[in-house]
């Protein structure tokens, strides 16, 4: 029978954090500073991602893994791998092209990002409003009106610190 000789690629022995250096007889050389190889057998190391400007470093680059970025305070990440930073707003606001705007009456936002959403319509579930909504909080639905004992109030006003959700646009 004919013996087949397996030609193993010498570069396959190079571990993560190194590259197969063609200029040095394919020996495994460490990745230069600010570069990495996350898998073995690579012929080059990749430049690390640079967390610059609005981005700040969440995880430093190492010889075997890329840097990871997040956003500077006042911003939050968007996109795959935090490829963009979006301005934060306050609770009770949403971000528009012209900046942060208060939620319209009947809507709320309980986060620093995202859009204002309509208050829950309790009556759709046959329930009544237990606590009024604000710009920052949804309404709280309670038992249906029929479940309430005569003379009981069906609406509890929000805590004094919270003003009812109304904002002129």
């Amino acid at each position: 029978f004919e013996r087949t000789r397996s030609l193993q690629d010498p570069c396959s022995n190079c571990p993560a954090g190194t590259f197969c250096d063609n200029n040095r007889n394919q020996i495994c050389s460490p990745c230069p500073p600010n570069s990495f190889s996350s898998a073995g057998g690579q012929r080059t190391c990749d430049i690390c991602r640079q967390c610059k400007g609005v981005f700040r470093t969440r995880k430093e680059c190492s010889s075997t893994s890329n840097a990871e970025c997040d956003c500077t305070p006042g911003f939050h990440c968007l996109g795959a791998g935090c490829s963009m930073c979006e301005q934060d707003c306050k609770q009770g606001q949403e971000l528009t092209k012209k900046g942060c705007k208060d939620c319209c009456f009947g809507t709320f936002n309980d986060q620093k990002r995202g859009i204002c959403r309509p208050w829950t319509n309790c009556s759709l579930d046959g329930k009544s409003v237990l606590v009024n909504g604000t710009k920052e909080r949804d309404v709280v639905c309670g038992p249906s009106p029929a479940d309430l004992s005569p003379g009981a109030s069906s609406v509890t006003p929000p805590a004094p610190a919270r003003e009812p959700g109304h904002s002129p646009q």
């Epitope: 991602r49 006042g74 968007l78 996109g79 490829s83 963009m84």
Partner: antibody
Framework: EVQLVESGGGLVQPGGSLRLSCAAS??????????VGWIRQAPGKGLEWLAL???????YYSPSLKSRLTISRDNSKNTLYLQLNSLRAEDTAVYYC???????????????WGQGTLVTVSS | DIQLTQSPSSLSASVGDRVTITCRAS??????LAWYQQKPGKAPKLLIY???NLETGVPSRFSGSGSGTDFTLTISSLQPEDFATYYC????????FGQGTKVEIK
């Protein structure tokens, strides 16, 4: 409305220096997240990024030009500057000032550009 | 440094044509890629950011796709005002631009 207006271009002798200015309006150079930079374009050629400074005063330079460039800003005047030394004929270009990011989403792109200022290096 | 190579460097097309321009990065850059349009004597104008997001006010006939090393700018139906030079730009490490693609009238 965001506006960037460059000035300081003109005819410069080889070996000399130039200092370009970029007056910003409609936003503050010191607002968190904001970065503003310089990009140039030689006649009939493509765009070449030169330098950028961010609100935290971190500075970034093109490796090939780092030794000849200085980027700075004056927050009180809301103005950006670029100093380029040891000028050569190949530095002849239109120099643009540009702001990083868009209105509410910021990243590593340039949404706002000035009209550019022409620098000619010749004896 | 990270290099960006655009192809073709120039192309001729007619109004109504679908036009595709590609940009290849010398290594993976995630989605850190933007596209610009530039007309003679004018500053560049941002079209697409983060590889596929259309900048406000840019017509929907422009679209971007890709991630990693290969990116595409597509103009679905070329209009007279679209004849210009287009540049890609990466922001993964520092900032660099492609060499440009000139779209001319056939």
């Amino acid at each position: 409305e965001v506006q960037l207006v460059e000035s300081g271009g003109g005819l410069v002798q080889p070996g000399g220096s130039l200092r370009l200015s970029c007056a910003a309006s409609g936003f503050s150079l010191s607002t968190g997240g904001v970065g503003v930079g310089w990009i140039r374009q030689a006649p009939g050629k493509g765009l070449e990024w030169l330098a950028l400074i961010d609100w935290a005063d971190d500075k970034y330079y093109s490796p090939s030009l780092k030794s000849r460039l200085t980027i700075s800003r004056d927050n009180s005047k809301n103005t950006l500057y670029l100093q380029l030394n040891s000028l050569r004929a190949e530095d002849t270009a239109v120099y643009y000032c540009a702001r990083g990011g868009s209105d509410t989403v910021i990243g590593d792109w340039f949404a706002y550009w000035g009209q550019g200022t022409l620098v000619t290096v010749s004896s | 440094d990270i290099q960006l190579t655009q192809s073709p460097s120039s192309l001729s097309a007619s109004v109504g044509d679908r036009v595709t321009i590609t940009c290849r990065a010398s290594q993976s850059i995630g989605s850190y890629l933007a596209w610009y349009q530039q007309k003679p004597g004018k500053a560049p104008k941002l079209l697409i950011y983060d590889a596929s997001n259309l900048e406000t006010g840019v017509p929907s006939r422009f679209s971007g796709s890709g991630s990693g090393t290969d990116f595409t700018l597509t103009i679905s139906s070329l209009q007279p005002e679209d004849f210009a030079t287009y540049y890609c730009q990466q922001g993964y490490y520092l900032w660099t631009f492609g060499q440009g693609t000139k779209v001319e009238i056939k």
